[in-house]
C-alpha cells in the first residue's frame, strides 16, 4: 500500500536569464528511493540513481545541473522553460510517486515565487 | 570494456527445462538492471524480462509469466535465467542486455541459441 | 501494453542518402524511447537513447526525435557500413516493447 505523499515547490516564477530550483520531497514512507526522474511535458531532463548517480540528458546538460539533493536547478531560463515539470520518484516497495510544478518564466524583472519549502 | 557472456543455450524437448547464464564483466554489477531479450529466427526483437539491481523488483512478460524465472548473483556477476515447460515458441536466441537507468539497454551480450523440438 | 509501429517495415537506399525511420507508440511515452541497429548473427546495438541522445561512440550522422507518440531516427548520409535492421523500443512501462524493425537494404 502506498502511504507516501510528495510535496513540490508548486508553482513558481523565475525571471527570464535566471535560474531556479525544483525541488520535490517524499514523506509519509519508509520506502527506499531507488531512482528520481525529471521530465518536463514530454521529455526527460535528468536521472538521479541511487547507485548510477546522475545522467543529465545530453541536450539540456549546458543549462541542467544536478541537486541540491534530489533536486534540479535550471539555468539561463527562457520563456520556452515555462510550463509542467515531473518528478517521477521510484521507490521499493511502494512502487512510483509523481509530483508536479509549474514554472513560468516571466520577461519583467519582477518574478513573484509560489510557495517554498526548506529541504533539511 | 564491458562484456557480457551467455551461456546454456541448445536443444530441448518441449516441456523441458534450460538454464541459462550471463556472465557479467569490466563494470559495477551490481548497480545495474539487466534484462533478457529474444529474437526467434528470422523475426525481431522481444523482451523476457528484467531485473532490478539489488533483485527487489522482477518483471516479466506475459508469454513466459509462471514459467520462466529470473535472478542474478552479483557475488558472481551473473544472471540468470531459468526456463521450465519450454514450447517450440520459446525457440530463439536470447541475449542479456545492461539497462542503466531502467531507461536504455547499452550492452548486449553475443546471445546463446534455444531450440526447443522433439 | 503499449504497442510500437515502426515505417517503413523495408527501404532500399544508396550511399549518401538521407534515411528517415518512423516509430509510432500506442500512448504517450514522453521521450523513453531507444534505437537499435542489428546486423545479421550479431547483437543489437543501442544508437540512440531517450528519444534524442547520441550513445557513445555512434557516427554524428545518426539523430533521433521526437516525444510523446512520433518518433524518427534520421541518417544523415547513409554509408555502407549503416545497412541493418533498425529497432525502436519503448521503456516507459512493462512490458518493454519493440517495434517490428525496418530494414535498410541497398538500392
Known amino acids: 500500500m502506498m502511504t507516501g505523499t510528495i510535496e513540490t515547490t508548486g508553482n513558481i516564477s523565475a525571471e527570464k536569464g535566471g535560474s531556479i530550483i525544483l525541488q520535490c520531497h517524499l514523506s509519509s514512507t519508509t520506502a527506499q528511493v531507488t531512482q528520481v526522474n525529471w521530465e518536463q511535458q514530454d521529455q526527460l531532463l535528468a536521472i538521479c540513481n541511487a547507485d548510477l548517480g546522475w545522467h543529465i540528458s545530453p541536450s539540456f546538460k549546458d543549462r541542467v545541473a544536478p541537486g541540491p539533493g534530489l533536486g534540479l536547478t535550471l539555468q539561463s531560463l527562457t520563456v520556452n522553460d515555462t510550463g509542467e515539470y515531473f518528478c517521477i520518484y521510484h521507490t521499493y516497495p511502494d512502487g512510483t510517486y509523481t509530483g508536479r510544478i509549474f514554472l513560468e518564466v516571466l520577461e519583467s524583472s519582477v518574478a513573484e515565487h509560489g510557495a517554498r519549502f526548506q529541504i533539511p | 570494456e564491458v562484456q557480457l557472456l551467455e551461456s546454456g543455450g541448445g536443444l530441448v524437448q518441449p516441456g523441458g527445462s534450460l538454464r541459462l547464464s550471463c556472465a557479467a564483466s569490466?563494470?559495477?554489477?551490481?548497480?545495474?538492471?539487466m534484462h533478457w531479450v529474444r529474437q526467434a529466427p528470422g523475426k525481431g526483437l522481444e523482451w523476457v524480462a528484467s531485473?532490478?539491481?539489488?533483485?527487489?523488483?522482477?518483471y516479466y512478460a506475459d508469454s513466459v509469466k509462471g514459467r520462466f524465472t529470473i535472478s542474478r548473483d552479483n557475488s558472481k556477476n551473473t544472471l540468470y535465467l531459468q526456463m521450465n515447460s519450454l514450447r517450440a515458441e520459446d525457440t530463439a536466441v536470447y541475449y542479456c542486455?545492461?539497462?542503466?537507468?531502467?531507461?536504455?539497454?547499452?550492452?548486449w551480450g553475443q546471445g546463446t541459441l534455444v531450440t526447443v523440438s522433439s | 501494453d503499449i504497442q510500437m509501429t515502426q515505417s517503413p517495415s523495408s527501404l532500399s537506399a544508396s550511399v549518401g542518402d538521407r534515411v528517415t525511420i518512423t516509430c509510432r507508440a500506442s500512448?504517450?511515452?514522453?521521450?523513453?524511447l531507444n534505437w537499435y541497429q542489428q546486423k545479421p548473427g550479431k547483437a543489437p546495438k543501442l544508437l540512440i537513447y531517450?528519444?534524442?541522445s547520441l550513445q557513445s561512440g555512434v557516427p554524428s550522422r545518426f539523430s533521433g526525435s521526437g516525444s510523446g507518440t512520433d518518433f524518427t531516427l534520421t541518417i544523415s548520409s547513409l554509408q555502407p557500413e549503416d545497412f541493418a535492421t533498425y529497432y525502436c523500443?519503448?521503456?516507459?512501462?512493462?512490458?518493454?516493447?519493440f517495434g517490428g524493425g525496418t530494414k535498410v537494404e541497398i538500392k
Open positions: 569490466g563494470f559495477t554489477f551490481s548497480s545495474y538492471g
Open positions: 531517450a528519444a534524442s
Open positions: 523500443q519503448q521503456s516507459y512501462s512493462t512490458p518493454l516493447t
Open positions: 531485473i532490478k539491481y539489488s533483485s527487489s523488483n522482477k
Open positions: 542486455a545492461r539497462g542503466p537507468y531502467d531507461v536504455w539497454l547499452d550492452y
Open positions: 500512448q504517450s511515452i514522453s521521450s523513453y
